[in-house]
Interface confidence: medium
C-alpha cells in the first residue's frame, strides 16, 4: 500500500504526524492560543513531548531568528506549578531551564537561551512570537 | 477547484435595493469566513462586508453599516448581500471572496485574509 | 486605521520593484499583498508578511518590520505589470491600500 504523507495548510511545516505553524507576530499568550485555534483542524498552541520534537521545531525556527522567546501551549491554569499543555496531551517530557519558576509566570516559552531546547517561564500578558501545533 | 460565481448585479436607481449571490463549490463552505469586496470604476479595493463560517458572526465598513445585511445558506452553498437605501457612490464591481484558511471559531486571535476571488458582479447605482 | 501606498513604481525588465505599505505599527499587523491586473480579479500573492501561495513565482517576496511592509519583485516580468494592494485585518475590518501601479518599461 502506498501510504500519503498528510499534508499540513501553507506555511506550516510538517513532522511525526503533526503539523506546526511558528507565528511572529506579538501576542500575549491567550491571544496566542486564541489564534492558534482560528486556524481550525483542532490546532493549539504547541505541546512539546520529546527531545527529538523539540530539536526538530529548534531547527525550523532557529532559521528564522534565534533570539526571540517564542510561547508554546504549556500554561499553569491554577498559579498552583501545576503545568499542563493546552492541548490535553500528557505533561512527561520535560525541558526547564532551572530558571526560577516563581513570581508572577504562568506561561511557558521556549528560551532562545539554549537554541529553543529548554523552557522558560514568563508573565502571560507578555507579548511575543508563538507556535502552533495541530494533527492533520 | 475551488470556485465562486456572484450574481445578481444590475441598474439600480438611488434609493432601490439590489440583492447579490456568490454560489461556491469545490471546498466545504460552512468551514470559511467569506466577505465581499468591491472595486468602483478605475478605483481601489474597499472591503465591504464579512461573515464567519456559521453565520454566527458578521462585520461590515463603516460606509454600509445600515444598509447592507451579508448572510449565508451553508445548505445551498451561498453566500449573500443585501443592499438597501443604495446610493451612487456604491456602483462598482462586488467580488464575494474565501478566507485564506479555515477558522473555527472566527472572533477574537484571528483576522480575515481574502484568498480565492470570484469574477466579480456589476452594480451601477444611476437614475 | 490607514495603509498608504505609493501611486505607481516604474521598473525596467530584470529589475527589483519595491512597492511599499506604512500603517501605525504596521509590524503588529499581518500584511497580505494582492496583484490585480485590468480587467481580472485580485490573486493573493504574499500572506502573514512574507508568505507566499505555492502558485506564486519566487520572485514575489514580502517583508515588515516597523510602521512599513514591503512588497518585492526581483527580475520583474512584463507579466508583473499590474496593480498591487496591500491589506490588512484591524479591529473587525479589513483595509485595504489605495495600490500601486507597477509599470514594467
Known amino acids: 500500500d502506498i501510504i500519503m504523507r498528510p499534508s499540513c495548510a501553507p506555511g506550516w511545516f510538517y513532522h511525526k504526524s503533526n503539523c506546526y505553524g511558528y507565528f511572529r507576530k506579538l501576542r500575549n499568550w491567550s491571544d496566542a492560543e486564541l489564534e492558534c485555534q482560528s486556524y481550525g483542524n483542532g490546532a493549539h498552541l504547541a505541546s512539546i513531548l520529546s527531545l527529538k520534537e523539540a530539536s526538530t521545531i529548534a531547527e525550523y525556527i532557529s532559521g528564522y531568528q534565534r533570539s526571540q522567546p517564542i510561547w508554546i501551549g504549556l500554561h499553569d491554569p491554577q498559579k498552583r506549578q501545576q503545568w499542563q499543555w493546552i492541548d490535553g496531551a500528557m505533561y512527561l517530557y520535560r525541558s526547564w531551564s532551572g530558571k526560577s519558576m516563581g513570581g508572577n509566570k504562568h506561561c511557558a516559552e521556549m528560551s532562545s537561551n539554549n537554541n529553543f531546547l529548554t523552557w522558560s517561564s514568563n508573565e502571560c500578558n507578555k507579548r511575543q512570537h508563538f507556535l502552533c501545533k495541530y494533527r492533520p | 477547484e475551488v470556485q465562486l460565481l456572484e450574481s445578481g448585479g444590475g441598474l439600480v436607481q438611488p434609493g432601490g435595493s439590489l440583492r447579490l449571490s456568490c454560489a461556491a463549490s469545490?471546498?466545504?463552505?460552512?468551514?470559511?469566513?467569506m466577505s465581499w469586496v468591491r472595486q468602483a470604476p478605475g478605483k481601489g479595493l474597499e472591503w465591504v462586508s464579512a461573515?464567519?463560517?456559521?453565520?454566527?458572526?458578521?462585520y461590515y465598513a463603516d460606509s454600509v453599516k445600515g444598509r447592507f445585511t451579508i448572510s449565508r445558506d451553508n445548505s445551498k452553498n451561498t453566500l449573500y448581500l443585501q443592499m438597501n437605501s443604495l446610493r451612487a457612490e456604491d456602483t462598482a464591481v462586488y467580488y464575494c471572496?474565501?478566507?485564506?484558511?479555515?477558522?473555527?471559531?472566527f472572533g477574537s486571535g484571528s483576522y480575515l485574509n481574502p484568498f480565492d476571488w470570484g469574477q466579480g458582479t456589476m452594480v451601477t447605482v444611476s437614475s | 486605521y490607514e495603509l498608504t501606498q505609493p501611486p505607481s513604481v516604474s521598473v525596467s525588465p530584470g529589475q527589483t520593484a519595491s512597492i511599499t505599505c506604512t500603517g501605525d505599527?504596521?509590524?503588529?499587523?499581518?500584511v497580505s499583498w494582492y496583484q490585480q491586473k485590468t480587467g481580472r480579479s485580485p490573486v493573493l500573492v504574499i500572506y502573514?508578511?512574507?508568505r507566499r501561495p505555492s502558485e506564486i513565482p519566487e520572485r514575489f517576496s514580502g517583508s515588515n518590520s516597523g510602521n512599513t511592509a514591503t512588497l518585492t519583485v526581483s527580475g520583474a516580468q512584463s507579466m508583473d505589470e499590474a496593480d498591487y494592494y496591500c491589506?490588512?485585518?484591524?479591529?473587525?475590518?479589513?483595509?485595504f491600500g489605495g495600490g500601486t501601479k507597477v509599470t514594467v518599461l
Open positions: 469545490g471546498f466545504t463552505f460552512s468551514s470559511y469566513a
Open positions: 461573515i464567519s463560517g456559521s453565520g454566527g458572526s458578521t
Open positions: 502573514q508578511d512574507d
Open positions: 471572496a474565501r478566507d485564506r484558511v479555515r477558522r473555527v471559531p
Open positions: 491589506q490588512v485585518w484591524d479591529s473587525n475590518t479589513v483595509i
Open positions: 505599527k504596521l509590524a503588529e499587523k499581518y
